[in-house]
């Protein structure tokens, strides 16, 4: 739960827990005007502010999760994530402080995205009071996912998982009991949280390759929409 | 829920050294823990953090393998290679705070009480 | 990312208020945090996102800031605020030499 955040999430407008910070999903103005002393967002501080979006949607889906079932403390995690093929950052990927590698890095975080976005559509119907929020944190992804191709060079080495595959697994994740459903719900959101924030690290660990500026609108409160790829 | 850091005594320039730090209260398998240094009389100096599910650990620029930090699963550990006089400081472990309660940064909420550690000849 | 904090030391009477600032050498959004040490002890957290009240921390002190230049204020000092303040930023990734400031030492007359 928010130590500091006053009402409850409602629509996409995701709170961003700071009043300098009010952030919109992608493709929607906000409603605030940009504080005249901003810098324009740079491509590497477009990409830090998606993510973070993106990972305070998950925080709101995980608060909703947390609160009508006991997985959050349950010690039979082991046994559902066997069944689930959940993207993980490991020390070949690249995007550890030891070893790391721009191309390899970015390569295994894009992919990385790509094979949660069935795990993504999975979640779609599994929250009441939070349907948007999981919408907004699935269409957010998909623009991160654009945003971050476009940075990459090696784009032959991103493989995109087969369709079939993924219908075959959606439908498999759907038919699983009532307890199994909401242990990987809360497996999803919970290596979807930690898979972000170690892209995040790895992301800023990049700087150069990312820090081109590509806004000269100066819309410092407007996240990345399909018109800025 | 609590910290504490034990290991640190008198060792000559070049002898290396483990701290570790114990928690209770809280599950390491769940929060990401850091060590940072103070030398007597100065600032505090942030050595590196050791992330949780993924297992990679961030250092300080100025590290350079002088600090080694590893993670089981029920102590943090901090390796001093190759100490020298100017590693002579009070160590301490804390624990950084979940995303759910602080945000996309890293917020260190719990600490122990440091343990002092002297490279002399 | 460096952090650097002004003044090093401030002395304040009794009552009177306090005002610490720290500078980020590249934009570190709202991602700062303050931490009080007394002499002796283990710091003890007081705000993060550079503004919110870690809790039980007495509503005295309050912080603001974006970017680049955050501020840390006592307002009503009392003898037991007497302590070395620190700023950290809480950008992991990236080239980080130190996540904290050098601290300001508050002396209470």
């Known amino acids: 739960d928010y130590k500091d955040h006053d009402g409850d999430y409602k629509d996409h407008d995701i709170d961003y827990k700071d009043d300098d910070d009010k952030l919109v999903p992608p493709g929607e103005d906000s409603k605030d005007v940009a504080a005249p002393h901003r810098q324009p967002l740079t491509s590497s501080e477009r990409i830090d502010k998606q993510i973070r979006y993106i990972l305070d949607g998950i925080s709101a889906l995980r608060k909703e999760t947390c609160n009508k079932s006991n997985m959050c403390e349950s010690s039979k995690e082991a046994l559902a994530e066997n069944n689930l093929n959940l993207p993980k950052m490991a020390e070949k990927d690249g995007c550890f402080q030891s070893g790391f590698n721009e191309e390899t890095c970015l390569v295994k975080i894009i992919t990385g995205l790509l094979e949660f976005e069935v795990y993504l559509e999975y979640l779609q119907n599994r929250f009441e009071s939070s349907e948007e929020q999981a919408r907004a944190v699935q269409m957010s992804t998909k623009v991160l996912i654009q945003f971050l191709q476009k940075k990459a060079k090696n784009l032959d080495a991103i493989t995109t998982p087969d369709p079939t595959t993924n219908a075959s697994l959606l439908t498999k994740l759907q038919a699983q009991n009532q307890w199994l459903q909401d242990m990987t719900t809360h497996l999803i959101l919970r290596s979807f949280k930690e898979f972000l924030q170690s892209s995040l690290r790895a992301l800023r660990q990049m700087g150069d390759l990312i820090s081109v500026p590509v806004d000269s609108r100066g819309s410092e409160q407007k996240l990345i929409s399909e018109e800025d790829l | 829920q609590s910290v504490e850091e034990s290991g640190g005594r008198l060792v000559t320039p070049g002898t290396p050294l483990t701290l570790t730090c114990t928690v209770s209260g809280f599950s390491l398998s769940s929060y990401a823990m850091t060590w940072v240094r103070q030398a007597p009389g100065k600032g505090l100096e942030w050595i590196g953090t050791?992330?949780?599910?993924?297992?990679d650990t961030w250092y300080a620029s100025w590290v350079k393998g002088r600090f080694t930090i590893s993670k089981t699963s029920t102590t943090v550990d901090l390796k001093i290679t190759s100490p020298t006089t100017e590693d002579t400081a009070t160590y301490f472990c804390?624990?950084?705070?979940?995303?759910?309660?602080?945000?996309?940064?890293?917020?260190?909420?719990?600490w122990g009480p440091g343990t002092l550690v002297t490279v002399s000849s | 990312y460096d952090m650097t904090q002004t003044p090093a030391s401030v002395e304040v009477a009794v009552g009177g208020t306090v005002t610490i600032k720290c500078q980020a050498s590249?934009?570190?959004?709202?991602?700062l945090s303050w931490y009080q040490q007394k002499p002796g002890q283990r710091p003890k957290l007081l705000l993060y996102?550079?503004?919110t009240l870690a809790s039980g921390v007495s509503s005295r002190f309050s912080g603001s800031g974006y970017g680049t230049e955050f501020t840390l204020t006592i307002s009503g000092v009392q003898c037991e605020d007497a302590a070395t303040y620190y700023c950290q930023q809480g950008y992991t990734g990236g080239n980080v030499d130190n996540a904290f400031g050098g601290g300001t030492k508050v002396v209470v007359v």
């Open positions: 804390a624990r950084v705070g979940d995303y759910d309660d602080y945000g996309a940064h890293d917020v260190f909420d719990s």
């Open positions: 590249e934009s570190i959004s709202s991602w």
């Open positions: 050791s992330y949780v599910y993924s297992g």
């Open positions: 996102r550079a503004s």
